[in-house]
Amino acid sequence: AGHLEQPQISSTKTLSKTARLECVVSGITISATSVYWYRERPGEVIQFLVSISYDGTVRKESGIPSGKFEVDRIPETSTSTLTIHNVEKQDIATYYCALWEV
């Protein structure tokens, strides 16, 4: 079974800068899975942000504009990355990755 690790416990960024979060997949080939990213803002329910499927197709939360969150995967390091562009106060949250084994 696949296992996920998010090595960064926290990330502090200056407003308008870029934040890059990592999710390391082990126990399964990342190219054979779909990785999902969610966020939980203080006092709010968890929210789906974006996913990247085994074939590379990206799907995002339709209510969030393109260009805000960028998801990628690096097979060589078995890592999925979530890049948050132009960091703002409403991006303060806990971000989670999740795995869907195909």
Epitope: V58, S62, G63, S66, G67, E70, Q90
Partner: antibody, heavy 118, light 108 residues
């Protein structure tokens, strides 16, 4: 069927203002982020602005920042673009478009023409 | 800002021929965030391809996209009369979203 209908274009003098509207139907308007894109006469496409479903995220192209304001009214299924301090280089056809789960510009309106001239 | 450059500016071909349109990004773009659009005179653009290679709903399979990094290609395997139009590439991985300058495919 998804429909986007822009209105509000017209002729305006440099320094003037105009408010564009985009009336939407055929989809869950309040769940989608939306965009404005423009096309100057005989030129290519230029992204202008985007707004999230709840209006919490708003982005602008540098060329319009501080002059244009994007907004939406989910109760009226409408998107707006308030354009102030208009310049000749803002002359273009303005399109509204959806920004769905598979990326932006999946559905487009027919466009409304803005001409800035003295 | 990621600058998208398309070539050639104009492509003169006959119906039935193969069209190959190029798009180059000024910095690396994830292939998941590259789209192609078609625009005919007096009409709004229409999305053909998203994610560099996935066809949008209702797009014929003679249209195909490929590429990664900074170099992307749109191929029309056999040009039909209705395919003569202007084509734009666009990246949507990061704001500002940027379009290429377009390639006009005209009848030879």
């Amino acid at each position: 069927e998804v429909q986007l209908v822009e209105s509000g274009g017209g002729l305006v003098k440099p320094g003037g203002s105009l408010r564009l509207s985009c009336a939407a139907s055929g989809f869950a308007f309040s769940s989608y982020s939306l965009t404005w894109v423009r096309q100057a006469p005989g030129k290519g496409l230029e992204w202008v602005s985007s707004i999230s479903s709840s209006s919490s995220y708003i982005f602008y192209a540098d060329s319009v920042k501080g002059r244009f304001t994007i907004s939406r009214d989910n109760a009226k299924n409408s998107l707006y673009l308030q354009m102030n301090s208009l310049r000749a280089e803002d002359t273009a056809v303005y399109y509204c478009a959806t920004d769905g789960e598979l990326g932006p510009f999946d559905y487009w309106g027919q466009g409304t023409t803005v001409t800035v001239s003295s | 800002e990621i600058v998208m450059t398309q070539s050639p500016g104009t492509l003169s071909l006959s119906p039935g021929e193969r069209a190959t349109l190029s798009c180059r990004a000024s910095q690396s773009v994830s292939s998941s965030y590259l789209a192609w659009f078609q625009q005919k005179p007096g009409q709004a653009p229409r999305r053909l391809i998203y994610g560099a290679s996935s066809r949008a709903t209702g797009i014929p399979d003679r249209f195909s996209g490929s590429g990664s990094g900074t170099d992307f290609t749109l191929t029309i395997s056999r040009l039909e009369p209705e395919d003569f139009a202007v084509y734009y590439c666009q990246q949507y991985g990061r704001s500002p979203l940027t379009f290429g300058g377009g390639t006009k495919v005209e009848i030879k």
